[in-house]
Interface confidence: low
């Protein structure tokens, strides 16, 4: 579907056009581009009101709009692969015509992060609400649409065309019709300001073909920043009406002569311009020579002026425009300084937070503070960082080095630690013996005892648990689970062998095969059933079947 220009508003040095038509953002941008513009920017509250006005004009004529919510594309987009930046007003979006990251924004709701596809912004109009200045259209972001599928509720788009300057509308001193044709191919008979290079066709008369006179004018740059039609005196004047029709086309005063002729004049403090119609203030500030937020300040006796900038800005070389002062040049911050329009802000490096003596100071974040520690066990705060440590019998684990994993002394590298059975426990281990053997006083060796079919020498009670006596581990069959949250037993160990817990008697294996052969320090592994000693079924930390999952608190232990 095509797009119709339904409305136009020209103000300052720009014109905004509103179009109805269900187009994708790319098609809408292409439509604006064909006429020398772009999808509209909304860089300030003032510009938002201009856009609101042109949409109001469009909606006034668009009786067919039945949707309660309507969306109109503007020129704010985020390319595929570019992620959301919540710290910026534009959230990582940028204006299609280029330009800086502007401070004004009016988002409809909090944005969700998605870097996968291109995202485009539309103005969301609630047609059930009056278009009041305090109720500016909200910004809604979403997919950019595609030909034939423009996007949900997309009703149209707004273009912006920028110009060197504007001419005043032509004033008629008698009956007639003015038709303006703009460089962006819009025709209108009523514009508040008419853009440079527009043509004006004036047809004088009251419709009688015989009486109709036509005039053609072009809005030209007469002098730097001075634009006019090159016409002189009111148009379509008629002795029949004199000053009675539209004030004779005069901007301020109209003076009639006795013969039906008349002249335009100006009030005190104003002067008549070369077009003999328009009055301009003798006050040099009235032409708004200052730009970019600069305020015009009259000199003595109102003869000349100077431009003054708001705090955080300074005059540029033209002495007419304000540019941002980069306060960060003076290093006002202890760590990072971010220049912003009209000011700056101090930021702290990762591991520091605002605080301490002086403006913009930063102080170390104590990551180890109570209730804040990212470490599973020991935590040591350092300047701008921290490191984790583990109790004896545990080693640091996890991608971020904040978790502690039990050392399984029964399966580690090195020589045998127990002569026979090895039982791993949380943070420790102990040795055991097969039925018919008993643990020697050294807690490692096994000595022959009375033959029994009872359980092997199982793990002692918690309070009897001995200290670890070394780091070597025998090649005995063991289960070495990782530590679960709070050390609580969970699920079965990850080993594929059947577990032999401390309270389960060995009944499934033939006794002759379990009996030690030769030295009691050697246990020949049975060829059929694999007996495994474990301290109890447990699951890796993190609650799933993977080993030592990373905690998700964003810390990496190393900043």
């Amino acid at each position: 579907t095509g797009a119709d220009t339904e409305a136009v508003v020209c103000v300052g040095t720009a014109c905004y056009t509103a179009h109805s038509g269900k187009l994708s953002a790319a098609e809408a941008q292409n439509h604006c581009n064909q006429n020398g513009g772009n999808l509209a920017t909304v860089k300030s509250k003032e510009e938002a009101q201009h856009v609101q006005r042109v949409l109001a004009q469009l909606l006034r004529r668009e009786a067919a709009l039945t949707a309660r919510m309507s969306k109109f594309w503007i020129g704010l987009q985020r390319e595929k692969g570019k992620c959301l930046d919540p710290s910026l007003p534009l959230k990582g979006f940028s204006w299609v015509g280029g330009g800086e990251d502007t401070p004004y924004s009016n988002w409809h709701k909090e944005l969700r992060n998605s870097c996968i596809s291109k995202r485009c912004v539309s103005l969301l109009l609630d047609l059930s609400q009056p278009l009041l200045p305090s109720r500016l259209p909200k910004w809604s972001e979403g997919p950019c649409g595609s030909p034939g599928s423009p996007g949900s509720n997309i009703e149209g788009f707004v273009c912006k065309f920028s110009f060197k300057g504007m001419c005043r509308p032509l004033a008629l001193g008698g009956p007639g019709q003015v038709t303006y044709t703009t460089p962006f191919q819009t025709t209108s008979s009523s514009l508040e300001a008419v853009p440079f290079a527009s043509a004006a066709n004036v047809a004088c008369g009251e419709g009688d073909k015989d009486e109709t006179q036509s005039h053609y004018f072009l809005c030209k740059e007469k002098a730097p920043d001075v634009f006019d039609w090159g016409s002189s005196g009111p148009l379509c004047v008629s002795p029949k009406y004199g000053c009675n029709f539209n004030n004779g086309g005069c901007h301020q005063d109209c003076f009639e002569g006795g013969d039906g002729s008349f002249l335009c004049g100006c009030r005190p403090g104003f002067r008549l311009l070369d077009d003999l119609v328009t009055c301009a203030s003798r006050n040099p500030c009235s032409s708004s020579p200052c730009r970019g937020g600069a305020t015009c300040v009259l000199g003595p006796h109102g003869k000349n002026y100077t431009c003054r900038c708001p705090q955080g800005y300074q005059l540029d070389s033209s002495q007419l425009d304000c540019v941002d002062v980069d306060e960060c040049q003076d290093s006002p911050c202890a760590q990072e300084c971010v220049n912003t329009p009209g000011g700056f802000r101090c930021e702290c490096w990762v591991g520091y937070e605002p605080g301490g003596p002086g403006e913009g100071a930063c102080q170390d974040v104590d990551e180890c503070a109570l209730g804040r520690s990212p470490c599973a066990q020991g935590c040591t705060n350092t300047d701008g960082s921290f490191h984790c440590s583990c109790e004896e019998g545990y080693v640091l684990a996890g991608e971020d080095g904040t978790q502690c994993q039990d050392v399984d002394e029964c399966v580690g590298p090195g020589g045998p630690l127990c002569d026979s059975l090895c039982f791993n426990t949380q943070g420790s281990f102990h040795c055991g013996c097969l039925p018919g053997w008993v643990l020697a006083p050294n807690g490692v060796s096994c000595t022959m005892g009375p033959v029994s079919l009872g359980p092997p020498s199982g793990p002692p009670d918690e309070e009897d648990k001995g200290e670890k006596e070394g780091s070597t581990v025998p090649r005995a069959a063991t289960a070495s689970p990782t530590r679960g949250p709070e050390g609580t037993p969970k699920a079965t160990p990850t080993t594929s062998r059947p577990s032999l817990s401390s309270d389960a008697p060995i009944t499934s294996a033939p006794l002759k095969m379990l009996a030690p052969s030769g030295s009691p320090g050697v246990w020949r592994e049975p060829s059929i059933h694999h007996a495994t000693a474990a301290s109890g079924p447990q699951e890796p930390a993190g609650g799933d079947s993977s080993v030592a999952t990373q905690n998700n608190d964003g810390t990496d232990g190393q900043k």
Partner: antibody, heavy 120, light 111 residues
């Protein structure tokens, strides 16, 4: 010249409805919003709602929502305001007034007012 | 709703003297550099008549002895030299937010 002319005075019983008219002349009817404002004896002026004559969009003061209906007849350049479920406190002078389309919607032209009396 | 409070309720001023009426909004009625505050004059048996729009702009045909000032929440209507025909009730109105609301009115009389 620009003029708004309202219908004549009305006397109604509580619970009834009243429909007032406002005929515009001297300007393009569809280029301005039409508002209704009322003034009860000794009370401040109270905005009731507005209509865009070109598209018939209506916006109401929530206080009257459900009781007030504003309509237009473009061909007759006339706006209407109907107020239902009348109560004694609806006794007031009702004015129609026009405003520009966008921005500061001040009321630059007013009708002379219609007196509505609600009494049992 | 934005509540508009006018003071004083009534004012008696000698002919040729200055009359000042105040209007206070419960929240700012400014937007984009403009104040959405208007003043109306109402004479007995007549509809209100627009005097000032956007806080300080004189409606065409209104005598220049009437002037308006203020921004944000505080506004003033001034009659520089009171004339007999200025005896009326004056109302302020905000048009920045729905519902559009009016002040309670200030009655101006001749002393």
């Amino acid at each position: 010249q620009v003029q708004l002319v309202e219908s004549g005075a009305e006397v109604k019983k509580p619970g009834a409805s009243v429909k007032l008219s406002c005929k515009a002349s001297g300007y393009t009817f569809t280029s301005y919003w039409m508002h209704w404002v009322r003034q009860a004896p000794g009370q401040r002026l109270e905005w009731m709602g507005e209509i865009d004559p070109s598209a018939s969009y209506t916006y109401y003061n929530q206080k009257f929502k459900g009781r007030v209906t504003i309509t237009v007849d473009k061909s007759a350049s006339t706006a209407y305001m109907e107020l239902s479920s009348l109560r004694s406190e609806d006794t007031a002078v009702y004015y129609c007034a026009r405003s520009v389309y966008y921005g500061n919607k001040y009321f630059d032209v007013w009708g002379p007012g219609t007196t509505v009396t609600v009494s049992s | 709703d934005i509540v508009m409070t006018q003071s004083p309720d009534s004012l008696a001023v000698s002919l040729g003297e200055r009359a000042t009426i105040n209007c206070k909004a419960s929240q700012s009625v400014d937007y984009a550099g403009d104040s959405y505050l208007n003043w109306y004059q109402q004479k007995p048996g007549q509809p209100p008549k627009l005097l000032i729009y956007a806080a300080s702009n004189l409606e065409s045909g209104v005598p220049d002895r009437f002037s308006g000032s203020g921004s944000g929440t505080d506004f003033t209507l001034t009659i520089s030299s009171l004339q007999a025909e200025d005896v009326a009730v004056y109302y302020c109105q905000q048009t920045n937010e729905d519902p559009r609301t009016f002040g309670g009115g200030t009655k101006v009389e001749i002393k």
